[in-house]
């Protein structure tokens, strides 16, 4: 069965500043991955980022740097100030559309005890299966 | 499919200046990164330079000081401004696009032939 998997990291040198990184774990080949926070997109999420392997990516701020790290993962660094600006309760998610397995979603946010700098282990999400 | 246009190329003397553009069909996303390539006659093609969508960029030794990549306000836009030209950078110019940055998908314009001569 396909997993997704979300970490969620604040940098230490800038507070405002987050990486959010999802890999997908299955053998499909994907197609596209869209990013959002607030919540899963298309329920009341907002995107932050899409990703086509093909085509290219688009991103919307706070987003600063959406990229490939792998054919099956990838980073986003957000950064913003006032009301930009994540906050440490901010749920990030991931969903990837992949080909056989179907669309896959994950959501994750910072670990409540991390200090600036710190990250859980990206271990898989609560798996939300989009169709 | 991404479509790449290159135009500017031409013949120009030592010394002089030319500058290349290349337009991308893509619109809507970014392309992770573009770059520019060249190949002389005889010539296996090689990297010029590169910059990334946030504006990294990448040149080669042999143009450093030269030449400048940059990408313009349209979405996509490419530009190779090069100056002091030599000889030996006769070739063609090419536009190259992989839109994700891991050579998953990889797109090339047809080319536009430079000549430095006198």
């Known amino acids: 069965t396909p997993e997704v998997w979300v970490q969620v990291r604040m940098e230490a040198t800038e507070l405002s500043s987050f990486t959010i990184r999802c890999g997908f774990l299955g053998s499909g080949s994907i197609s596209l991955v869209t990013v959002s926070w607030g919540g899963p997109n298309g329920a009341g999420g907002t995107t932050l980022a899409v990703l086509h392997p093909e085509r290219g990516i688009r991103q919307w701020a706070p987003a600063r740097q959406a990229r490939w790290e792998t054919q099956s993962s990838i980073s986003l660094i957000l950064e913003g100030s006032g009301a930009s600006s994540p906050c440490a309760n901010t749920t990030f998610c991931c969903k990837f559309a992949s080909f056989p397995e179907g669309s896959w979603e994950a959501c994750g946010s910072l670990p409540p005890s991390s200090d600036p700098g710190l990250s859980a282990p990206p271990t898989p999400a609560p798996i939300l299966r989009a169709d | 499919e991404v479509q790449l246009v290159e135009s500017g190329g031409g013949l120009v003397q030592p010394g002089g200046s030319l500058r290349l553009s290349c337009a991308a069909s893509?619109?809507?996303?970014?392309?992770?990164?573009m770059g520019w390539y060249r190949q002389a006659p005889g010539k296996d093609r090689e990297l010029v330079a590169t910059?990334?969508?946030?504006?990294?960029?990448k040149i080669v030794d042999s143009v450093k000081g030269r030449f400048t990549i940059s990408r313009g306000d349209a979405k996509n836009s490419l530009y190779l401004q090069m100056n002091s030209l030599r000889a030996e950078d006769t070739a063609v110019y090419y536009c190259?696009?992989?839109?994700?940055?891991?050579?998953?998908?990889?797109?090339w314009g047809q080319g536009t032939m430079v000549t430095v001569s006198s």
């Open positions: 190259n696009a992989d839109p994700s940055g891991l050579g998953r998908k990889v797109y």
């Open positions: 893509e619109t809507y996303f970014d392309l992770y990164v």
């Open positions: 910059i990334t969508y946030t504006g990294s960029i």
